[in-house]
């Protein structure tokens, strides 16, 4: 995930309890990774700015048949005000940059941990 133009508040940011559970699920994915996550599937990178939860979901929802990220997809759907379906693309996607799901998850996790530490959740 790339952050263009510096840090922006990703509002409305999830309640801290929900953000904590998303972080824990991403930790679980990264720790339990033995084979390549989602068979090495590639997803669009996103900007970590306002609206990033929907953008992250729009990117990950295009990965099908990967049970490891299903819970993450469900959690992200609770952080996005609109219905997201495969093939949707947000302006937050870095459309010329694709990365592996494993890297996407790691980058998202690092950013969410930063948000959580800084108390930017409500």
């Amino acid at each position: 995930l790339t952050c263009l133009g510096g840090f922006a508040s990703p509002g409305p940011v999830p309640p801290s309890t929900a953000l904590r559970e998303l972080i824990e699920e991403l930790v679980n994915i990264t720790q339990n990774q033995k084979a390549p996550l989602c068979n090495g599937s590639m997803v669009w990178s996103i900007n970590l700015t306002a609206g990033m939860y929907c953008a992250a979901l729009e990117s990950l929802i295009n990965v099908s048949g990967c049970s490891a990220i299903e819970k993450t997809q469900r959690m992200l759907s609770g952080f996005c005000p609109h219905k997201v379906s495969a093939g949707q693309f947000s302006s937050l996607h870095v459309r010329d940059t694709k990365i592996e799901v494993a890297q996407f998850v790691k980058d998202l996790l690092l950013h969410l941990k930063k948000l959580f530490r800084e108390g930017q959740f409500n």
């Epitope: 409305p12 801290s16 309890t17 559970e21 824990e24 609770g78 996005c80």
Partner: antibody, heavy 121, light 113 residues
């Protein structure tokens, strides 16, 4: 079904430490957080903190930092809370609960039967 | 910390009566992205553990009788029992799970005449 079995009543001296346990069954222990809640003499409920057993990550109520330490043993599906430097103010019933606030599909919160701690000289 | 204020602190009603109790939070518990209120209601009978009745402010837990109804949004919430039964004798607590520390109201004690 989901069950949380807490350890029996404890009697402790002021200044001592005590470790309460909460054994989970009926679900995957590492999938959900465990919260601890204090209730004094039939009074209100006070959230102490929570632990995520898979990672060991914890979140505490500032009021209980330095008083309570939460741990979890994945192999036995048991969560623990150690209370130290006990005073009469720590005499209470302590509950554990297993929870998730995952949206939009899930919410649950299952409670243990409580452990009564009495601190007395 | 989010403060949770419940009223009344106690009330006595006859079997069959309708009763309502309120809970006010010091800040909004509504998350605009999913339009969910991070509020639950618990029932604690004498000598027992708390039992969740309602979550997301208005969703009834499985197995909870439909005489229990949760309503409200933002900072103002209500638990209504449409027709009180003797077994409803308990203390009722509201709980916010929006942010840390999670907090509870002081409870409303329901006594059955």
């Amino acid at each position: 079904q989901i069950q949380l079995q807490q350890s029996g009543a404890e009697l402790a001296r002021p200044g001592a430490s005590v470790k309460l346990s909460c054994k989970a069954s009926g679900y995957t222990f590492t999938s959900y957080g465990i919260s601890w809640v204090k209730q004094r003499d039939g009074q209100g409920l006070e959230w102490i903190g929570e632990i995520y057993p898979r990672s060991g990550n914890t979140d505490y109520n500032e009021k209980f930092k330095g008083k309570a330490t939460l741990t979890a043993d994945k192999s036995s599906s048991t969560a623990y809370m150690e209370l130290r430097s006990l005073t009469s103010e720590d005499s209470a019933v302590y509950f554990c609960s297993s929870f998730t606030t995952l949206v939009p599909t899930d919410y649950f919160d299952y409670w243990g039967q409580g452990t009564t701690l009495t601190v007395s000289s | 910390d989010i403060m949770m204020s419940q009223s009344p602190s106690s009330l006595a009603v006859s079997v069959g009566e309708k009763v309502s109790m309120t809970c006010k939070s010091s800040q909004s518990l509504l998350y605009s992205s999913n339009q969910k209120n991070y509020l639950a209601w618990y029932q604690q009978k004498p000598g027992q553990s708390p039992k969740m009745l309602i979550y997301w402010a208005s969703t009834r837990e499985t197995g909870v009788p439909d005489r229990f109804t949760g309503s409200g949004s933002g900072t103002d919430f209500t638990l209504t029992i449409s027709s009180v039964m003797a077994e409803d004798l308990a203390v009722y607590y509201c709980h916010q799970y929006f942010t840390y520390p999670r907090t509870f109201g002081d409870g409303t004690k329901l006594e059955v005449k």
